[in-house]
Interface confidence: low
């Protein structure tokens, strides 16, 4: 077969297909460039358009910034001339790649600009509690689009020791199942570490005052987190799933995890934080169902049921 010389492959037409795009969540920091990625294939050659919050967005028109638009692609980088320029560009972006056969659309890319994090100034009243009772010291870090790390320390920058009795929750709060007079300190300080901005900020110190009693009263377990009897969660396939139960009581309750709907996937489950956290690596369809935590001590038990629905990522 002889193919005429004038025949070229580009006569075969292909509708656009997005081949590369930024992640759905993108966090930028005050000094970072903003880079949004959108690549697509197609014949005739694909052309690109962006929207921000549903409105036509033209990077090349933005004032006070330098824009580099990659040739033959929808990707662009914006470089600012001041430390806070990223705030201007927060929003939900979408890339459209089109040729005459049609249009392909990227997923929504939520661009979040993190400013320099600050804890609101507040007057922290001393927390007064009787020996043997439970208490929660709140952290409440400023909102952050990026994952941040929480540490509880004292004024000597020593970590607060955690065990079955004293636990930091996923939310950053410090939970005491029951307090001892040895917990009496005026300097419980919550530190928030923002890796992206390489910033550590600290909350005003909390003064925990423990009043001694002659006899500590035994109490059966009660869940401090979650506080209700059941909750429903959606887990994404292939993503990790973290379930948490923190209980109070005296003696200190122990936590057990059960799966009424079937065996616990032992090869993919880890227990952390003195059994208070169950982490399931790479969720699959078979992980759908009920997970139950049981807090027990010599006086009784408390439970929470997590109903997990697994969805495609």
């Amino acid at each position: 077969i002889q193919i005429p010389e004038e025949y070229e492959g580009h006569h075969v037409m292909e509708p656009p297909v997005i081949t590369e795009q930024s992640p759905r969540r993108l966090v930028v920091f005050p000094t970072d460039d903003i880079s949004l990625k959108c690549e697509a294939s197609g014949k005739p050659e694909v052309q690109f358009r962006w929207t921000r919050d549903g409105v036509h967005f033209k990077p090349k028109e933005e004032l006070g910034v330098t824009v580099y638009q990659s040739p033959h692609s929808g990707s662009f980088t914006i470089t600012g001339n001041n430390s806070n320029f990223a705030q201007r560009f927060q929003g939900i972006y979408r890339c459209f790649a089109s040729n005459k056969l049609g249009t392909a659309m990227s997923h929504e890319i939520r661009l979040m600009a993190e400013g320099a994090p600050k804890w609101p100034k507040e007057t922290v009243k001393p927390v007064e509690v009787e020996e043997g009772e439970s208490v929660v010291l709140p952290c409440n870090p400023p909102p952050s689009a990026e994952p941040l790390r929480i540490y509880w320390m004292n004024s000597k920058i020593l970590h607060i020791k955690q065990d079955e009795r004293v636990t930091m929750g996923q939310n950053g709060n410090l939970y005491f199942a029951n307090v001892l007079t040895s917990d009496n300190h005026s300097d419980y300080i919550c530190h928030a570490h923002f890796p992206g901005t390489r910033t550590i900020i600290q909350k005003e110190p909390i003064d925990l005052r423990v009043k001694a009693t002659n006899s500590m009263i035994d109490r059966k377990p009660r869940l401090l987190f979650p506080t209700n009897s059941s909750s429903h969660l959606v887990a994404l396939q292939g993503q990790p799933l973290v379930l948490e139960c923190i209980a109070e009581g005296f003696p200190t309750p122990t936590i057990k995890w059960l799966r009424p709907s079937g065996p616990m996937p032992a090869d993919r489950v880890t227990y952390q934080n003195h059994n208070k956290t169950l982490q399931l690596l790479k969720v699959g369809e078979e992980d759908d169902g009920e997970y139950r935590c049981l807090a027990e001590n010599s006086l009784g038990s408390a439970r929470h049921a997590y109903y997990v629905t697994v969805e495609a990522a």
């Epitope: 690109f48 033209k58 005459k100 049609g102 249009t103």
Partner: antibody
């Protein structure tokens, strides 16, 4: 800001050729197709064709295939349209227009009036 | 080629009035896979280049006053000016970019009484 600069009027003789230019600035020249549009005096708009500055690829309106040749010079961010065998019918304003992805022409040059007259 | 037909060819209205103009295409401009209509509206004031007002039949170009709106789907489209201002005196063209060659309507001329 984006600018498409076209030269002023051109007076040419019937049968001759003319090469119109469109100098682009304020954006990445190779990232967007350049359109060319004809408007005869008191008439509507006609699409002549388009060129991709990054690789020189063109799409023409069949009506103009034997009349217009589109080209670019990336080194000076300029698009060109050569019109040949000119007749009175070619007397018109010729616009270059930038399109940034959906063919809608969102930046236009100010147009060059070509007058074909002996 | 897709033929674009605009009506009326001209209209005269008073300032503050609502205006609608029509554009019909000989083939559907709706691309089923993304439900977008590949139609744009342009405004051309006397002695000036055309200016993009609307794309995708109903999406206002950034910087265009919200008194301009586009509607319609398939083959029938409308440009509406909710409250005409004197500065809106111009020719208005629709254009399809669904298929090559891209084609324009013959225009609607808007005048003020």
């Amino acid at each position: 800001q984006v600018q498409l600069v076209q030269p002023g009027d051109e007076l040419v003789k019937p049968g001759a050729s003319v090469k119109l230019s469109c100098k682009a600035s304020g954006y990445t020249f190779t990232s967007y197709w350049m359109q060319w549009v004809k408007q005869r005096p008191g008439q509507g708009l006609e699409w002549i064709g388009e060129i991709n500055p990054s690789n020189g690829r063109t799409n023409y309106n069949e009506m103009f295939k034997s009349k217009a040749v589109l080209s670019v010079d990336k080194s000076v961010s300029t698009a060109y349209m050569q019109l040949s065998s000119l007749t009175a019918e070619d007397t018109a304003v010729y616009y270059c227009a930038l399109y940034d992805g959906y063919y809608a022409m969102d930046y236009w040059g100010q147009g060059t009036l070509v007058t074909v007259s002996s | 080629d897709i033929v674009m037909t605009q009506s009326p060819s001209s209209l005269a209205v008073s300032v503050g009035e609502r205006v609608t103009m029509s554009c019909k295409s000989s083939q559907s401009l709706l691309y089923s896979s993304n439900q977008k209509n590949y139609l744009a509206w342009y405004q051309q004031k006397p002695g000036q280049s055309p200016k993009l007002l609307i794309y995708w039949a109903s999406t206002r170009e950034s910087g265009v006053p919200d008194r301009f709106s586009g509607s319609g789907s398939g083959t029938d489209f409308t440009l509406t000016i909710s409250s005409v201002k004197a500065e809106d005196v111009a020719l208005y063209y629709c254009q399809q970019y669904h298929s090559y060659p891209f084609t324009f309507g013959q225009g609607t001329k808007l005048e003020i009484k």
